[in-house]
């Protein structure tokens, strides 16, 4: 028995299955509480840059400084964690770049320190002293076996030096590790000599080898990753997303839904709507409309952008995610204010997912 009346088809997957859908993995900036963080908006030719956090407009305050393409957060706290975006408005178009900020005392796994360190690992050599690659911090490499719960972030590091400065590449199970080998790809931070995989799934299990080489030699080190999970799971949605938002009539707003799934996720954005002046069908169930869903013709389904909003756009927006195992959904409310009222952050209400056991 469906719990709603369909205004548009809300079948689980698109009619044409997506061939290349990937879970988006924004750049992650990690800071310890109390530290300052500076991020540069990685967009070119920006006439005007606007910033959002969790889909809500971000303005300057006593801890947040916005200068040109830079965002500075002074004395970071865990409340500063979230999904940030900078939007570059140009004369003909606009473009948005997303990144995550994680203010935490410890990284999920694979390292004892966060990603703001590493400067000590980048050893500069006297240009005359030619030297084959060597490890600069073997303590960070002692733990070879990493047993990590699914959906966690894994970081492997191989801090090295040499002259000329060595290059680093990674192998998985002895073969070249390519971005397309895992949903969401991976990140290599050359300045930190690290490989980062977010939201690991069972197929990420295996041996990961860093190969560090220059013209005078090559060294390597292998880590073993075990992803601990005994049965496939329904999708997991990041708590607090999408976040409630408010804007004025004519304004723009974004809702973001962060998805972790070890099986292909299908994302739908759904809104309660009226049909013939009624919010409910003859059966007493609410009318719902699918605003966006993942598929061949849909880009970045995790983000729902609304432009030039009207009062009719106010209401509840549902992010519904499914894989072959099950579903999850979370929702947020959009408040549309009259033109004279400035938008403000609403009291946050995190909708409970519907799959609690």
């Amino acid at each position: 028995r469906p719990s709603f009346s369909l205004v548009e088809d809300t079948t689980l997957e698109p009619e044409e299955p997506p061939t290349k859908y990937q879970i988006s993995q924004p750049e992650v900036y990690v800071a310890a509480p109390g530290e300052s963080l500076e991020v540069r908006c990685l967009l070119k030719d920006a006439a005007v840059i606007s910033w959002t956090k969790d889909g809500v407009h971000l303005g300057p305050n006593n801890r947040t400084v916005l200068i040109g393409e830079y965002l500075q957060i002074k004395g970071a706290t865990p409340r500063d964690s979230g999904l940030y975006a900078c939007t570059a408005s140009r004369t003909v178009d606009s473009e948005t770049w997303y990144f995550m900020v994680n203010v935490t005392d410890a990284i999920s796994s694979g390292d004892d320190e966060d990603d703001t360190d590493g400067a000590e690992d980048f050893v500069s050599e006297n240009s005359n002293n030619k030297r084959a690659p060597y490890w600069t911090n073997t303590e960070k490499m002692e733990k070879r076996l990493h047993a990590v719960p699914a959906a966690n972030t894994v970081k492997f590091r191989c801090p090295a030096g040499g002259n000329p400065m060595p290059t680093m590449r990674w192998l998985k199970n002895g073969k070249e590790f390519k971005q397309e080998h895992r949903i969401g790809g991976y990140k290599v931070r050359n300045q930190h000599w690290s490989l980062i995989m977010e939201s690991v799934v069972p197929s990420d299990k295996g041996n990961y080898t860093c190969v560090v080489e220059n013209e005078y030699g090559s060294i390597n080190h292998t880590y073993h990753l075990d992803v601990v999970e005994r049965s496939p799971h329904r999708p997991i949605l990041q708590a607090g997303l999408p976040a409630n938002a408010s804007t004025v009539v004519g304004g723009d707003v974004e809702f973001v839904c962060k998805v972790y799934s070890d099986a292909q996720p299908h994302i739908q954005w759904i809104k309660h709507v009226e049909k013939n002046g009624s919010k409910y069908g003859p059966d007493g169930l609410p009318y719902l409309k699918v605003l966006k869903h993942s598929g061949i013709n849909s880009s970045n389904a995790e983000v729902l952008a609304l432009f030039n909003v009207t009062e009719a756009d106010a209401g509840e927006y549902i992010c519904k995610v499914s894989n072959y195992i099950g579903q999850a959904n979370q929702s947020a409310w959009l408040t549309v204010l009259p033109k004279q009222q400035a938008p403000g952050r609403e009291k946050e209400i995190t909708a409970s997912p519907d799959y609690l056991e």
Partner: antibody, heavy 113, light 107 residues
Amino acid sequence: QVQLVQSGAEVKKPGASVKVSCKASGYIFRNYYIHWVRQAPGQGLEWMGAIYPDNGDTSYNQRFKVRATLTADTSTSTVYMELSSLRSEDTAVYYCARAFTYWGQGTTVTVSS
Amino acid sequence: DIQMTQSPSSLSASVGDRVTITCRASENIYGALNWYQQKPGKAPKLLIYGATNLADGVPSRFSGSGSGTDFTLTISSLQPEDFATYYCQNVLSTPYTFGGGTKVEIK
């Protein structure tokens, strides 16, 4: 423990319909897709469709979209698969499965004039 | 639809042999692949999910590998109870297509 118990064998004439049931127990019924897979004699496995009992969402293989109907009764933790306009090539064993991890014992449907 | 091609379609092996079955997807399915074992008159049994992860209650002699388009199921030392038909399945997107099956017979 998780169990899926299917209804008994059926013999149908061409053009008729058949409704196979799958009763689930041992887990929270609403929280997992129930998939239907069929296997013709001596052949491989073919996915037909799935239903999410919590809200009745369905997804079908295009080959069966017109003829197959999946429904769920949360009060009895039972899913039904109805296949209409039967033809001889629909003779097969029909399985229900919870997210492909746990499977029913299968229901044999024979279509013969 | 994503096509799944298994090879070989059948093989003969002896107890204790190492057996390898391959599965190729017509397009990149990342690690979204399951392996099943089926014995005559019985329902399929999940062996491996997510390409590499052993399902509950499955002996460790079974292992899965691969990602993208090429996948392998390996039985390290074939046991008498392993003689059966094995199927791979795409679980990336609907329709969730199966491979044609590989029948493992006694030599």
